[in-house]
Interface confidence: low
Amino acid sequence: LSLKGSQTLTVCPGSVQPLSSQTLRASSSAGTDPQLLLYRVVRGPQLGRLFHAQQDSTGEALVNFTQAEVYAGNILYEHEMPPEPFWEAHDTLELQLSSPPARDVAATLAVAVSFEAACPQHPSHLWKNKGLWVPEGQRARITVAALDASNLLASVPSPQRSEHDVLFQVTQFPSRGQLLVSEEPLHAGQPHFLQSQLAAGQLVYAHGGGGTQQDGFHFRAHLQGPAGASVAGPQTSEAFAITVRDVNERPPQPQASVPLRLTRGSRAPISRAQLSVVDPDSAPGEIEYEVQRAPHNGFLSLVGGGLGPVTRFTQADVDSGRLAFVANGSSVAGIFQLSMSDGASPPLPMSLAVDILPSAIEVQLRAPLEVPQALGRSSLSQQQLRVVSDREEPEAAYRLIQGPQYGHLLVGGRPTSAFSQFQIDQGEVVFAFTNFSSSHDHFRVLALARGVNASAVVNVTVRALLHVWAGGPWPQGATLRLDPTVLDAGELANRTGSVPRFRLLEGPRHGRVVRVPRARTEPGGSQLVEQFTQQDLEDGRLGLEVGRPEGRAPGPAGDSLTLELWAQGVPPAVASLDFATEPYNAARPYSVALLSVPEAARTEAGKPESSTPTGEPGPMASSPEPAVAKGGFLSFLEANMFS
């Protein structure tokens, strides 16, 4: 590994400077991909901080970065202005470059922060040169809050500093007023004042009246040694701006600002919600904003003014929708620091927060909404609706874009078409069936979180209030009695005050549900059944002929019945009775009542009937009594617990 580049970075005071390949350039003899050339920050900066443009600039200190990120200009050094003035300051970063299997290389990056540098974002070379605001025809003191060259003094070692001063020479005088030092006017014959006089509050600007045009003066500032001797050191030539304002002027009042929200890489207009002021005596075009500091997640642009960034704009630009924020690929939120002025009052600081939204959200549907049949309603939970993006979105909002067919969504017991994730989490959002003709329903919602939306369909099903037999296998070729030990909707009957009805939707695959003749005198054999009631179950009038699977060797099998259960005043529900079957075993105690057993298993006690070739059970015995298996009637009774 080898390290090229100057390993020095020059930074303007209080600014952000990207590390570049000129500053830091690693290479390896193996021609390693820059993504694999890794820098570790062994000792971070003391006068500022190192951070990644694409990551949260307020978070943890940067620990690792790659050469590729340096090439991309994503590794930034930010100088933090100290409270004490300085002319030049030096910072160092200790880095360790690694790219296995090569040996690590230690590197020191020197950072020079200097007012000497030409800085676009800090055009003055002085600690402060902010300009002055003065009412028309009046006077105002120019203090070190507005003009301060104490950073030039800071270039002198502190023991000698008290013997030095900064001499200001006015090279162009104000045209609409006068400068006075200790009440004496400055003029071409006496164009000087000192930093010490500034600090003592002795410099005054007196406006001559006759209008509110801009004024100012140009000056040269340099160090002055003991007894007024000129000394080598930093110097600068600059202008000091003086804004004259109408004495009757009412300053603009900034209004509360709503953060701008947009997705990565998109653009969005900035409206009065983000930037507005109340100023009765200024037109929107007269209220000017200037960007003091921009975030790293994008820039402001003016529509009709090309695509590039702008640093100055007016309230008129905002009001007409011409100002937009263009987001780059960063996912980090940021803040614009702005100054706002109506051209007559001192500038006021303002800020514009920009939230970068997820480019997509997902509505997670973990399970359909199950409505208990007897209740006919159920609360939605996070199981049904939850929004995630790059994180969970607890502040998601939902809007119904396709309502349910057979019910309503309720909040506070009243129909609603909009609700929040918070309301879901609190169990306040309820689905209630209002039309009891379907066992299922669905509705479509549009979820909105941090400005991004996604739609989803929530399915609703009714959970049957039905007790279903869950015992061991049933004998193939037998007919068993369907009674409340197998299917029981008695609780539903009690809750609804009605006789529940069943409709066979599907199955069984091998066998059939039949109605059993009431007595020997009742004509005909068993009848195929598609509908029955709870009363039929309780009367023992139903049988399930358990068939044998065709075309395969005898053995255990599975089968099921799918039923729709209806009752008065509640939605119907679909339920299934799943059961296992096996070849009939006379020695096995079956825990259901058998109305007949396979022909081969019958004794003389039962009237022989022929079995169907397919293995379906033969016709029922004409007696409602169960058929007697081998081993006698008593053993059959005992085995089947038949009563």
Epitope: P269, G285, L302, V303, G304, G305, G306, G308, V310, R312, T314, A316, D317, S320, G321, R322, A324
Partner: antibody
Framework: QVQLQESGPGLVKPSQTLSLTCTVS?????????WNWIRQHPGKGLEWIGY???????NYNPSLKSRVTISRDTSKNQFSLKLSSVTAADTAVYYC?????WGQGTLVTVSS | DIQMTQSPSSLSASVGDRVTITCRAS??????LNWYQQKPGKAPKLLIY???SLHSGVPSRFSGSGSGTDFTLTISSLQPEDFATYYC?????????FGQGTKVEIK
């Protein structure tokens, strides 16, 4: 690159409504900012008629405001101009533009 | 409405000449000014936006300057394809308005 193409009748009778459509290709109408209509009377300068923004807001030239409607159809990536109660003074080449890019213009003559 | 006044209304120049067109706004428009070039039978083309920013694909011989109410379009060395009519347009205040145009002809 965004391209714009005006379409509509070249001849409109006085007192009727002039209707033009601008089809945007190479970009989405919801991505741009301002979709403008501008006209140029024969041998004369340019006059801004109005715009519709990417989010559907309008602004019109006050001199034409009472007669102008600009609308959009995002599904077709088009925006339209309707100018009612036309007179011979509305005879002009009508351009659709986002200022960076312009359509080639279409001449509309108002005559009976 | 803001009135935009261009001068001169027309000028004759030769290939290679330096040409300057001025545009004056009836009130301050800061830097919210575009310049367009239009050739006969064609749509205007954006040359310069925001007073001095060159639109993509526009030759560097075109430049713009000014602020407030007075603006200038300069063609440093006139080329045969530059003979056309030039318009300024303000977008500081609605309604957006254009200058009446300056026709640059061959001397």
């Amino acid at each position: 690159q965004v391209q714009l193409q005006e379409s509509g009748p070249g001849l409109v009778k006085p007192s009727q409504t002039l209707s033009l459509t601008c089809t945007v290709s190479g970009g989405s109408i919801t991505d741009g900012y301002y979709w403008n209509w501008i006209r140029q009377h024969p041998g004369k300068g340019l006059e801004w008629i109005g715009y519709i923004t990417f989010d559907g807001r309008n602004n019109y030239n006050p001199s034409l405001k009472s007669r102008v409607t600009i609308s959009r159809d995002t599904s077709k990536n088009q925006f339209s101009l309707k100018l009612s109660s036309v007179t011979a003074a509305d005879t002009a080449v009508y351009y659709c533009a986002d200022f960076d890019y312009w359509g080639q213009g279409t001449l509309v003559t108002v005559s009976s | 409405d803001i009135q935009m006044t261009q001068s001169p209304s027309s000028l004759s120049a030769s290939v290679g000449d330096r040409v300057t067109i001025t545009c004056r706004a009836s009130q301050g428009i800061r830097n919210y000014l575009n310049w367009y070039q239009q050739k006969p039978g064609k749509a205007p083309k954006l040359l310069i936006y925001y007073t001095s920013s060159l639109h993509s694909g526009v030759p560097s011989r075109f430049s713009g300057s000014g602020s407030g109410t007075d603006f200038t379009l300069t063609i440093s060395s006139l080329q045969p394809e530059d003979f056309a009519t030039y318009y300024c347009q303000q977008y500081s205040k609605l309604p957006w308005t254009f200058g009446q145009g300056t026709k640059v002809e061959i001397k």
